[in-house]
Interface confidence: medium
């Protein structure tokens, strides 16, 4: 599923991401935009043999199990395919674990490069939340 901007903002708010660990909703929507272009089925392969999955491009070396990533830790204890569902529950729950891990949203390269320090509130402006 490819979410609309405000549709995703509402879904993320429903799942408790607004101000989760101090990160406003705009940060999460911005991250999703530049990680996956709001596409729940996005997959991208990395040079280390891992793959990033879903709307927040969660990595198979650390966070989920795709059955084929050497040394996978599967810290979210889920199959990576669950992160590709049109229901973002699994992605949100795993993202909560990631953002609590010490580096905050710096774990997402796209957030670090494209969202951090910008007017992220623009990503939820005009949305009925």
């Amino acid at each position: 599923k490819v979410f609309g901007r405000c549709e995703l903002a509402a879904a993320m708010k429903r799942h408790g991401l607004d101000n989760y660990r101090g990160y406003s909703l705009g940060n999460w929507v911005c991250a999703a935009k530049f990680e996956s272009n709001f596409n729940t089925q996005a997959t991208n392969r990395n040079t280390d043999g891992s793959t990033d999955y879903g709307i927040l491009q969660i990595n198979s070396r650390w966070w989920c199990n795709d059955g084929r990533t050497p040394g996978s830790r599967n810290l979210c204890n889920i199959p990576c395919s669950a992160l590709l569902s049109s229901d973002i529950t699994a992605s949100v729950n795993c993202a909560k674990k990631i953002v609590s891990d010490g580096n905050g949203m710096n774990a997402w390269v796209a957030w670090r490069n494209r969202c951090k320090g910008t007017d992220v509130q623009a990503w939820i402006r005009g949305c009925r939340l």
Epitope: Q41, T43, R45, G49, G67, R68, P70, S81
Partner: antibody, heavy 115, light 107 residues
Framework: QVQLQESGAEVMKPGASVKISCKAT????????IEWVKQRPGHGLEWIGE????????YYNEKFKGKATFTADTSSNTAYMQLSSLTSEDSAVYYC?????????WGQGTTLTVS | DIELTQSPATLSVTPGDSVSLSCRAS??????LHWYQQKSHESPRLLIK???QSMSGIPSRFSGSGSGTDFTLSINSVETEDFGMYFC?????????FGGGTKLEIK
């Protein structure tokens, strides 16, 4: 137990297209990548590419882009590979395998003859 | 692409001999190297994953070693059922690649 059952041998004319199937049983089909491998005598094994049935995400070996197209039907737990514009170079045995990084589970192979 | 070179291309042995098959990668692949056996008109069979991890049901005479670019499959006291083709495969990066194979034949 995990099984991958491929479709039967095919004899095709040059220029035609063929669609090979791979039916998976014994595991959650949407969760694992299905990989396709080509084997020609004297050419060893070649990785064609892969599909994640749950999302339809595909990756192709550059060498096979434009030649192979992967699809999957999650209602029947079947993956498909279509090969187009067939030439004698496409004559080979084609395997599907479950993509675990390594390949423990293989189909029995589909022999394609182009002549 | 990572190239895997297997040697020798053919190995002629007598049952009871011990043999070593080599697989060399064109760049470091850590331990992401797997070994297969294939007999005529059969699908490949996974013997060893990640350089040295034997699969269940595989006889203990098969073992693997190496890291980086140089890998070895050893067969301690070859039995008649072991004759066939052996392939290595890397999963360190895409595209996945296979070695050209070593044919183990009866002398």
């Amino acid at each position: 137990q995990v099984q991958l059952q491929e479709s039967g041998a095919e004899v095709m004319k040059p220029g035609a297209s063929v669609k090979i199937s791979c039916k998976a049983t014994g595991y959650t089909f949407t969760t694992y990548w299905i990989e396709w491998v080509k084997q020609r005598p004297g050419h060893g094994l070649e990785w064609i590419g892969e599909i994640l049935p749950g999302s339809g995400s595909t990756y192709y070996n550059e060498k096979f882009k434009g030649k192979a197209t992967f699809t999957a039907d999650t209602s029947s737990n079947t993956a498909y590979m279509q090969l187009s514009s067939l030439t004698s170079e496409d004559s080979a045995v084609y395997y599907c395998a479950r993509g675990d990084g390594w390949y423990y589970y293989w189909g029995q192979g589909t022999t394609l003859t182009v002549s | 692409d990572i190239e895997l070179t297997q040697s020798p291309a053919t190995l002629s042995v007598t049952p009871g001999d011990s043999v070593s098959l080599s697989c060399r990668a064109s760049q470091s692949i850590s331990n992401n190297l797997h070994w297969y056996q294939q007999k005529s008109h059969e699908s490949p069979r996974l013997l060893i994953k990640y350089t040295s991890q034997s699969m269940s049901g595989i006889p203990s005479r098969f073992s693997g070693s190496g890291s980086g670019t140089d890998f070895t499959l050893s067969i301690n006291s070859v039995e008649t059922e072991d004759f066939g083709m052996y392939f290595c495969q890397q999963s360190n990066s895409w595209p996945r690649t296979f070695g050209g194979g070593t044919k183990l034949e009866i002398k």
